[in-house]
């Protein structure tokens, strides 16, 4: 049976959404983004043990083959299942504009 | 400038499509799949160095933060960008049926 969201490695060890506080300098954006100067970056971090938040059939296959051939096939990886949009205010040749991004901040996570 | 598909680690070391030969037993499907008995599983394997096949802005952020905080933020991960469908012949309660899977075999890869 799939254990879905229960982490067998202990609380907080498995694939989940984390928030990392970052400045524009950290992100390498200081030259072209005016605002905000700080971003609460949400990203997917953590281990992907068997059956934990498996995204699809491919993830199941990958885990099974990883157990058989760990040197050849890596374990599934914790990545965004969907994203939260964000608007940045940027410098442009003509002045200042709003720039919209659909794929900047992770919204939830799964194992692929 | 983005280096896109050129692997700075040497040929074949970066995120790309690999084929792994697997039996139904390897996949854990022997109980419910009749055919095929062997599958050429295509999956995404390899390193994700800076700017290599970055899927989106999130991948760029993740790489920048990984360089700053390698113990906290992992590097981007090599995962399928799209999938090839596959048809399996399965046992069912009523006999045998064709079952199509859209998310079984990786078609191409990127870093997220």
């Amino acid at each position: 049976a799939r254990n879905g969201d229960r982490c067998p490695l202990g609380p907080g060890r498995c694939c989940r959404l984390h928030t990392v506080h970052a400045s524009l300098e950290d992100l390498g954006w200081a030259d072209w983004v005016l605002s905000p100067r700080e971003v609460q970056v949400t990203m997917c971090i953590g281990a992907c043990p068997s059956q934990f938040r498996e995204a699809n059939m491919h993830a199941q296959i990958k885990m099974n083959l990883h157990r058989l051939k760990p040197d050849t096939v890596p374990a599934p990886c914790c990545v965004p299942a969907s994203y939260n949009p964000m608007v940045l205010i940027q410098k442009t040749d003509t002045g200042v504009s709003l720039q919209t991004y659909d794929d900047l901040l992770a919204k939830d996570c799964h194992c692929v | 400038a983005r280096n896109g598909d050129r692997c700075p680690l040497g040929p074949g070391r970066c995120c790309r499509l690999h084929t792994v030969h697997a039996s139904l037993e390897d996949l854990g499907w022997a109980d419910w799949v009749l055919s095929p008995r062997e599958v050429q599983v295509t999956m995404c394997i390899g390193a994700c160095p800076s700017q290599f096949r970055e899927a989106n802005m999130h991948a760029q952020i993740k790489m920048n933060l990984h360089r700053l905080k390698p113990d906290t933020v992992p590097a981007p991960c090599c995962v399928p960008a799209s999938y090839n469908p596959m048809v399996l012949i399965q046992k069912t309660d009523t006999g045998v049926s064709l079952q199509t899977y859209d998310d079984l075999l990786a078609k191409d890869c990127h870093c997220v």
Epitope: L34, P36, R37, P85, M86, V96, L98, T100 | -
Partner: antibody, heavy 120, light 107 residues
Framework: QVQLVQSGAEVKKPGATVKVSCKAS????????IHWVRQAPGQGLEWMGW????????VYAQKLQGRVTMTTDTSTSTAYMELRSLRSDDTAVYYC?????????????WGQGTLVTVSS | DIQMTQSPSSVSASVGDRVTITCRAS??????LAWYQQKPGKAPKLLIY???SLQSGVPSRFSGSGSGTDFTLTISSLQPEDFATYYC?????????FGGGTKVEIK
């Protein structure tokens, strides 16, 4: 918590200048831009412009261009909005609002508002 | 400039009712829409950003949906404190523009 506190109500004569202040606390002032919005009595909300304390870059609404100036003082974490050549139709409550942490074009939190009355 | 049209301009409802307010943009704005609540004599309060993301601290009875040009704010079960005026605002491009507002009144 994040707070924006605005200066008190003002009564001005037509042709005069008003300067409204907005003091920020509870966050790093130059990390987020400030928007200014006004609301005439019984009317809806009208966006006036935006400023980032970090660089002083501004964007103004076209209809106010030439009459409005937005500035910041990072030493006191205060934003200012100056409106010149006041007319009776500038009578409104003037609000400052910080960029939302999630997206720069959503506004929140807001200051409590400053009523500016233009009357001869 | 992008024009924002809200409807209805006012709605009478009772506590417990489901209330829906719509907002239409004059051109596509993807998901870049915010909703605000304003009570008399008070500053507006951000409820929803990016069309459907609930601002921290806002009750879950408020929800937003839509994309492109048509958007909806829904209050699933109206509470006494929800009687107020609601505004939509596009955040896709400068100048930012607001809808005309929808007053939710007690029936």
């Amino acid at each position: 918590q994040v707070q924006l506190v605005q200066s008190g109500a003002e009564v001005k004569k037509p042709g005069a200048t008003v300067k409204v202040s907005c003091k920020a606390s509870g966050y790093t002032f130059d990390s987020y831009g400030i928007h200014w919005v006004r609301q005439a009595p019984g009317q809806g909300l009208e966006w006036m412009g935006w400023i980032t304390a970090y660089s002083g870059d501004t964007v103004y609404a076209q209809k106010l261009q030439g009459r409005v100036t937005m500035t910041t003082d990072t030493s006191t974490s205060t934003a200012y909005m100056e409106l010149r050549s006041l007319r009776s139709d500038d009578t409104a409550v003037y609000y400052c609002a910080r960029e939302s942490g999630q997206t720069s074009s959503a506004l929140g939190p807001w200051g409590q508002g400053t009523l500016v009355t233009v009357s001869s | 400039d992008i024009q924002m049209t809200q409807s209805p301009s006012s709605v009478s409802a009772s506590v417990g009712d489901r209330v829906t307010i719509t907002c239409r943009a004059s051109q596509g704005i993807s998901r870049w829409l915010a909703w605000y609540q304003q009570k008399p004599g008070k500053a507006p309060k951000l409820l929803i950003y990016a069309a459907s993301s609930l601002q921290s601290g806002v009750p879950s009875r408020f929800s937003g949906s839509g994309s492109g040009t048509d958007f909806t704010l829904t209050i699933s079960s109206l509470q006494p404190e929800d009687f107020a005026t609601y505004y939509c605002q596009q955040g896709a491009s400068f100048p930012l523009t607001f809808g005309g507002g929808t007053k939710v009144e007690i029936k």
